[in-house]
């Protein structure tokens, strides 16, 4: 009786979530005479095992960040250990879970911006990395400004691109920043994974010190 978990030796691909303790077999290969036993080779990492009778399983939780795909080969052997079928490729794709925090590359960033700079033009980038799969929400990062100090009249002078971490001036910042009044600012910036959309997301913060420099360009006199 062949089914989802048993059948003949043929190329196959299986997807398994990382971080899960083994709970069931992966597959039961059926031997055709004169094959009496099976042999597993490839990227087993001492995690994947095949019993002589063809039962393929794994013995501990997988980690996608160590190896995202395990390329294995299974061969059927006769009673003399001679390969009579295969080896065939067996691919184990390790599915990502959100088991890694985003981390800023620096705990502190420093930058400068000239007053009256064009709004939206980046003058500094903050950058975080997350070992989780960037093709899934687990590794999709969302940058936010948490605090701007000082905050004058409750107006944000700085903005951040939520996806790229690019910091630039807001329209108000471009118009109102004046080094004579306040030459420096501090931002606390957070980064969240899960695209910032989940209560279960992980986060990290960093500090950004910004110096405002004088715009020395003067409009020519008429």
């Amino acid at each position: 009786q062949e089914g989802k978990f048993s059948g003949p030796l043929k190329p196959m691909t299986f997807s398994i979530y990382e971080g899960q303790e083994p709970s069931q077999i992966i597959f039961q290969f059926k031997a055709n005479p004169p094959a009496v036993t099976f042999e597993l080779t490839g990227e087993t990492d001492n995690i994947f095992v095949i019993e002589r009778e063809g039962l393929l399983y794994y013995n501990r939780a997988l980690d996608r960040e160590t190896r995202s795909t395990h390329n294995l080969q299974v061969a059927a052997l006769d009673a003399n250990g001679i390969i009579v079928e295969g080896p065939v490729p067996i691919t184990i794709k390790v599915k990502d879970i959100n088991d890694n925090r985003p981390t800023f590359l620096q705990s502190k960033y420093e930058g400068s911006v000239r007053q009256n700079s064009r709004p939206g033009k980046p003058f500094l980038y903050v950058n975080a990395t997350d070992l989780d799969d960037p093709a899934t929400p687990n590794g999709q990062l969302y940058y936010q400004i948490v605090i701007q100090l000082p905050m004058i009249n409750n107006v944000m002078y700085f903005q951040i691109n939520n996806k790229t971490g690019a910091i630039s001036l807001t329209r108000e910042g471009s118009q109102e920043l004046n080094p004579a009044k306040n030459p420096s600012y501090n931002l606390v910036i957070s980064v969240k994974d899960m695209g910032g959309q989940s209560e279960n997301s992980f986060s990290d913060t960093t500090s950004v010190d910004i110096i405002v420099t004088e715009n020395i360009w003067k409009a020519p006199k008429p």
Partner: antibody, heavy 126, light 108 residues
Framework: QVQLQQSGAELVKPGASVKISCKVS????????IHWMKQRPEQGLEWIAY???????????????GYNEKFKGKATLTADTSSSTAYMQLNSLTSEDSAVYFC????????????WGQGTTLTVSS | DIVMTQSPTLMAASPGERVTITCSVS???????LHWYQQKSGTSPKPWIY???NLASGVPVRFSGSGSGTSYSLTISSMEAEDAATYYC?????????FGSGTKLEIK
Amino acid sequence: QVQLQQSGAELVKPGASVKISCKVSGYTFTDHTIHWMKQRPEQGLEWIAYIYPRDGSTNYSEKFTGYNEKFKGKATLTADTSSSTAYMQLNSLTSEDSAVYFCARGYRGFFYFDYWGQGTTLTVSS
Amino acid sequence: DIVMTQSPTLMAASPGERVTITCSVSSSIRSSNLHWYQQKSGTSPKPWIYGTSNLASGVPVRFSGSGSGTSYSLTISSMEAEDAATYYCQQWSSYPFTFGSGTKLEIK
């Protein structure tokens, strides 16, 4: 201790058949392969075939035999698990079949012939 | 079929002499699949070295084996009278299993 006891010497006429036996003791018969080798006087060893006596029924056992192409049609291997005995039948005998025939156990760890029978001398002569 | 070529076919060595017998394989095999057997006149072969370099039970430590790919050898570090015998190499890599033609080693 492991032993492979072969049947005695045979003197047969050309065209006849002969069945040589190899009775094993000291281990579980169905756990290992039994191989047969041919050695002519002052010549080297030739591997004939093997049988893996995994099951008592002949039909099933025959699925677990393997022959050197050179000896297909000449040699037929069988096994009787109830008596832990392997057999090799040689048919259509000619003087070229005169030789000493050995059975040997295939060791499943490193796969080599770890125990041998004492040999059976076959003489084909009219 | 894989052809096993042994050399020399016949050799004589004095007691205490170092002896090397070679086995050339027609196509590359794994070292775990190369074995040596010793046979004395009128007796059945005995396993002598298995998997290229592992001494079978009871084999004196003056024997050793080495090699890889297509070239293998059996060495006796110091020849003794009881070592006089015929030695066969054998491959367990593919069917049909094949033996070398043998090296007959005599004592001087």
